[in-house]
Interface confidence: medium
Protein backbone atom coordinates (compact mmCIF):
# COMPACT_ATOMS: atom_id res chain seq x y z
CA UNK A 1 0.00 0.00 0.00
CA UNK A 2 0.93 3.50 -1.08
CA UNK A 3 1.43 5.69 2.65
CA UNK A 4 4.20 8.08 1.41
CA UNK A 5 3.03 11.46 2.62
CA UNK A 6 1.42 12.38 -0.50
CA UNK A 7 -1.02 8.93 0.04
CA UNK A 8 -1.70 9.67 3.40
CA UNK A 9 -2.34 13.29 3.17
CA UNK A 10 -4.87 12.61 0.32
CA UNK A 11 -6.32 9.72 2.07
CA UNK A 12 -7.24 12.00 4.87
CA UNK A 13 -8.52 14.63 2.54
CA UNK A 14 -10.92 12.11 1.34
CA UNK A 15 -12.03 11.38 4.43
CA UNK A 16 -12.18 14.91 5.74
CA UNK A 17 -14.10 15.70 2.23
CA UNK A 18 -16.59 12.55 2.78
CA UNK A 19 -17.67 13.64 6.45
CA UNK A 20 -18.15 17.66 5.44
CA UNK A 21 -14.68 18.57 7.01
CA UNK A 22 -13.53 21.95 6.03
CA UNK A 23 -9.59 22.72 5.32
CA UNK A 24 -8.33 25.91 5.65
CA UNK A 25 -4.45 27.24 4.56
CA UNK A 26 -3.81 27.89 7.80
CA UNK A 27 -5.50 24.58 9.56
CA UNK A 28 -3.02 21.38 9.16
CA UNK A 29 -5.77 18.44 10.68
CA UNK A 30 -2.30 16.04 10.38
CA UNK A 31 1.28 15.67 9.44
CA UNK A 32 2.00 16.13 6.09
CA UNK A 33 4.96 16.79 4.09
CA UNK A 34 6.78 15.02 1.17
CA UNK A 35 4.26 14.79 -2.00
CA UNK A 36 6.03 14.38 -5.22
CA UNK A 37 9.31 15.61 -4.99
CA UNK B 1 7.26 33.84 5.82
CA UNK B 2 8.40 29.89 5.50
CA UNK B 3 12.05 29.78 6.15
CA UNK B 4 14.68 26.40 5.84
CA UNK B 5 18.16 27.11 6.97
CA UNK B 6 20.58 24.26 6.29
CA UNK B 7 24.13 24.50 8.07
CA UNK B 8 27.35 22.08 9.28
CA UNK B 9 28.33 21.15 5.97
CA UNK B 10 32.46 20.77 5.29
CA UNK B 11 35.05 18.93 4.09
CA UNK B 12 35.56 15.39 5.80
CA UNK B 13 37.73 12.66 5.45
CA UNK B 14 36.42 9.15 3.95
CA UNK B 15 35.32 7.39 7.05
CA UNK B 16 34.34 10.49 9.05
CA UNK B 17 31.56 11.90 10.70
CA UNK B 18 29.34 15.29 9.85
CA UNK B 19 25.58 16.40 11.72
CA UNK B 20 24.50 18.81 9.19
CA UNK B 21 21.17 20.92 10.56
CA UNK B 22 18.18 23.06 9.33
CA UNK B 23 16.51 25.79 11.05
CA UNK B 24 12.72 26.07 10.33
CA UNK B 25 10.81 28.91 11.03
CA UNK B 26 7.18 30.47 9.85
CA UNK B 27 5.31 27.74 10.23
CA UNK B 28 4.13 24.97 13.11
CA UNK B 29 7.30 22.27 12.50
CA UNK B 30 6.08 19.55 14.67
CA UNK B 31 3.35 18.81 12.03
CA UNK B 32 5.10 18.32 9.21
CA UNK B 33 7.24 15.38 7.65
CA UNK B 34 10.19 16.81 6.28
CA UNK B 35 13.19 15.83 3.98
CA UNK B 36 16.69 15.31 3.15
CA UNK B 37 17.70 15.62 -0.53
CA UNK B 38 21.27 15.66 -2.30
CA UNK B 39 22.93 16.71 -5.47
CA UNK B 40 26.61 15.40 -6.01
CA UNK B 41 28.13 17.92 -8.18
CA UNK B 42 27.07 18.02 -11.92
CA UNK B 43 24.96 15.75 -10.84
CA UNK B 44 20.76 14.99 -10.47
CA UNK B 45 18.67 15.11 -7.35
CA UNK B 46 18.73 12.18 -5.06
CA UNK B 47 16.43 11.94 -1.79
CA UNK B 48 18.19 10.95 1.32
CA UNK B 49 15.70 10.55 4.03
CA UNK B 50 12.24 11.82 5.57
CA UNK B 51 10.89 12.03 8.76
CA UNK B 52 7.45 12.22 10.12
CA UNK B 53 5.53 14.61 12.15
CA UNK B 54 5.35 14.09 16.42
CA UNK B 55 2.00 12.81 16.07
CA UNK B 56 3.68 9.99 13.83
CA UNK B 57 6.03 9.52 16.01
CA UNK B 58 8.87 10.68 13.97
CA UNK B 59 8.89 7.47 12.18
CA UNK B 60 11.97 7.47 9.36
CA UNK B 61 12.54 6.38 5.98
CA UNK B 62 16.06 6.33 4.58
CA UNK B 63 17.56 5.22 1.02
CA UNK B 64 19.67 2.78 0.94
CA UNK B 65 22.58 4.26 -0.17
CA UNK B 66 22.87 5.91 3.21
CA UNK B 67 20.50 3.46 5.51
CA UNK B 68 22.41 2.87 8.56
CA UNK B 69 25.07 5.22 7.80
CA UNK B 70 22.79 8.16 7.94
CA UNK B 71 20.36 9.32 10.96
CA UNK B 72 17.82 11.53 10.30
CA UNK B 73 16.46 13.36 13.83
CA UNK B 74 14.57 16.13 14.26
CA UNK B 75 13.99 18.46 17.84
CA UNK B 76 10.18 20.25 17.67
CA UNK B 77 11.29 22.34 20.46
CA UNK B 78 13.87 23.99 18.76
CA UNK B 79 12.33 23.81 14.71
CA UNK B 80 15.47 21.77 13.68
CA UNK B 81 15.81 18.85 11.93
CA UNK B 82 19.31 17.34 11.64
CA UNK B 83 20.61 14.25 9.55
CA UNK B 84 23.32 12.65 11.27
CA UNK B 85 25.96 10.97 8.36
CA UNK B 86 28.48 8.82 9.65
CA UNK B 87 31.20 6.20 7.56
CA UNK B 88 31.06 8.82 4.73
CA UNK B 89 32.33 8.13 1.42
CA UNK B 90 33.66 9.81 -1.40
CA UNK B 91 30.10 9.65 -3.76
CA UNK B 92 28.45 11.55 -0.72
CA UNK B 93 29.76 14.37 -1.87
CA UNK B 94 26.95 16.73 -2.26
CA UNK B 95 24.64 20.08 -1.73
CA UNK B 96 21.89 18.62 0.92
CA UNK B 97 18.72 20.21 0.89
CA UNK B 98 15.95 19.91 3.70
CA UNK B 99 12.80 19.78 1.96
CA UNK B 100 9.22 20.70 2.99
CA UNK B 101 6.40 19.53 1.28
CA UNK B 102 2.72 20.10 2.03
CA UNK B 103 -0.37 18.87 -0.61
CA UNK B 104 -3.78 19.24 1.40
CA UNK B 105 -6.48 20.25 -0.76
CA UNK B 106 -5.78 23.75 -1.86
CA UNK B 107 -2.99 24.01 0.59
CA UNK B 108 -0.04 23.33 -1.26
CA UNK B 109 3.34 24.36 0.45
CA UNK B 110 6.79 23.78 -1.22
CA UNK B 111 9.80 24.72 0.49
CA UNK B 112 13.48 24.06 0.06
CA UNK B 113 16.61 25.62 1.96
CA UNK B 114 19.63 26.90 -0.02
CA UNK B 115 21.32 23.77 0.80
CA UNK B 116 25.27 23.51 2.29
CA UNK B 117 27.72 21.36 0.53
CA UNK B 118 29.44 18.41 2.28
CA UNK B 119 32.52 17.18 0.65
CA UNK B 120 33.83 13.87 1.61
CA UNK B 121 37.87 13.71 0.21
CA UNK B 122 41.36 13.15 1.89
CA UNK C 1 12.90 1.03 -7.11
CA UNK C 2 10.64 3.21 -9.36
CA UNK C 3 12.89 3.87 -12.44
CA UNK C 4 11.98 7.30 -14.08
CA UNK C 5 13.46 8.14 -17.20
CA UNK C 6 13.63 11.35 -18.60
CA UNK C 7 13.54 12.11 -22.50
CA UNK C 8 15.90 13.88 -23.92
CA UNK C 9 18.75 13.94 -22.11
CA UNK C 10 19.23 17.44 -24.12
CA UNK C 11 16.76 19.84 -25.74
CA UNK C 12 17.68 22.86 -27.79
CA UNK C 13 15.40 25.06 -28.45
CA UNK C 14 14.54 28.91 -29.22
CA UNK C 15 12.59 31.29 -27.34
CA UNK C 16 9.24 31.33 -28.63
CA UNK C 17 9.46 27.73 -29.48
CA UNK C 18 7.41 24.72 -27.70
CA UNK C 19 9.03 22.34 -25.45
CA UNK C 20 7.64 19.10 -25.14
CA UNK C 21 9.96 17.02 -22.03
CA UNK C 22 8.99 13.09 -21.27
CA UNK C 23 9.47 11.09 -18.24
CA UNK C 24 8.50 7.37 -17.99
CA UNK C 25 8.03 5.84 -14.74
CA UNK C 26 9.02 1.76 -14.88
CA UNK C 27 5.79 1.22 -12.30
CA UNK C 28 2.59 2.68 -12.13
CA UNK C 29 2.38 5.91 -10.15
CA UNK C 30 -0.87 6.88 -10.43
CA UNK C 31 -0.30 11.10 -10.77
CA UNK C 32 2.06 11.62 -8.14
CA UNK C 33 4.58 13.04 -10.51
CA UNK C 34 5.69 16.65 -9.62
CA UNK C 35 8.05 18.09 -12.30
CA UNK C 36 11.04 20.58 -11.44
CA UNK C 37 13.25 23.03 -12.37
CA UNK C 38 16.54 24.55 -11.09
CA UNK C 39 18.64 26.58 -12.32
CA UNK C 40 22.96 26.60 -11.60
CA UNK C 41 23.31 27.34 -8.01
CA UNK C 42 19.62 27.65 -7.13
CA UNK C 43 17.74 24.92 -4.82
CA UNK C 44 14.59 23.20 -7.15
CA UNK C 45 11.84 25.28 -8.14
CA UNK C 46 8.81 23.34 -8.28
CA UNK C 47 6.62 23.75 -11.15
CA UNK C 48 3.51 20.80 -11.23
CA UNK C 49 2.07 18.68 -8.51
CA UNK C 50 -0.17 15.77 -9.32
CA UNK C 51 0.63 15.32 -12.75
CA UNK C 52 -1.28 18.49 -14.12
CA UNK C 53 -1.58 20.63 -11.38
CA UNK C 54 0.44 23.66 -11.78
CA UNK C 55 1.88 24.79 -8.04
CA UNK C 56 1.54 28.74 -6.83
CA UNK C 57 2.84 31.45 -9.08
CA UNK C 58 4.39 29.33 -12.01
CA UNK C 59 3.08 30.74 -15.51
CA UNK C 60 0.48 29.57 -17.39
CA UNK C 61 2.69 28.46 -20.27
CA UNK C 62 3.74 25.58 -17.62
CA UNK C 63 1.53 22.52 -18.26
CA UNK C 64 1.65 18.83 -16.86
CA UNK C 65 -0.45 16.17 -18.37
CA UNK C 66 -0.23 12.10 -17.83
CA UNK C 67 -1.10 9.67 -15.61
CA UNK C 68 0.04 5.76 -14.56
CA UNK C 69 3.80 5.44 -16.24
CA UNK C 70 3.72 8.39 -19.03
CA UNK C 71 4.07 12.02 -18.23
CA UNK C 72 4.60 15.38 -19.99
CA UNK C 73 6.02 18.82 -19.56
CA UNK C 74 4.89 21.22 -21.74
CA UNK C 75 6.19 24.76 -22.39
CA UNK C 76 4.01 26.20 -24.32
CA UNK C 77 6.49 29.51 -25.33
CA UNK C 78 9.65 29.58 -24.17
CA UNK C 79 10.79 32.69 -22.51
CA UNK C 80 14.97 33.63 -21.62
CA UNK C 81 14.37 32.29 -18.56
CA UNK C 82 13.01 29.42 -19.10
CA UNK C 83 16.03 27.76 -19.31
CA UNK C 84 17.16 25.16 -17.44
CA UNK C 85 17.39 21.50 -16.11
CA UNK C 86 14.06 20.05 -15.60
CA UNK C 87 13.65 16.95 -13.65
CA UNK C 88 10.29 14.82 -12.49
CA UNK C 89 9.94 12.80 -9.34
CA UNK C 90 7.66 10.40 -8.11
CA UNK C 91 5.77 10.03 -4.70
CA UNK C 92 4.25 6.90 -5.19
CA UNK C 93 6.82 4.88 -3.15
CA UNK C 94 9.49 4.64 -0.91
CA UNK C 95 11.74 5.30 -1.96
CA UNK C 96 10.89 9.29 -3.84
CA UNK C 97 13.12 9.26 -7.09
CA UNK C 98 13.77 11.73 -9.69
CA UNK C 99 14.40 11.43 -13.17
CA UNK C 100 18.32 12.24 -14.23
CA UNK C 101 16.95 15.58 -16.10
CA UNK C 102 16.63 17.00 -19.06
CA UNK C 103 18.62 20.10 -20.14
CA UNK C 104 16.94 23.04 -22.21
CA UNK C 105 19.39 25.14 -23.69
CA UNK C 106 19.44 27.79 -26.18
CA UNK C 107 19.59 26.74 -29.80
Known amino acids: ACDTATCVTHRLAGLLSRSGGVVKNNFVPTNVGSKAF | EVQLVESGGGLVQPGGSLRLSCAAS????????ISWVRQAPGKGLEWVAE??????????HYAEAVKGRFTISRDNAKNSLYLQMNSLRAEDTAVYYC?????????????WGQGTLVTVSS | EIVLTQSPATLSLSPGERATLSCKAS??????VSWYQQKPGQAPRLLIY???NRYLGIPARFSGSGSGTDFTLTISSLEPEDFAVYYC?????????FGQGTKLEIK
Open chain 2, 26 to 33: GFTFSNYW
Open chain 3, 27 to 32: KWVTTY
Open chain 3, 89 to 97: SQSYNYPYT
Open chain 2, 99 to 111: RLYFDYGLAIQNY
Open chain 3, 50 to 52: GAS
Open chain 2, 51 to 60: IRSESDASAT
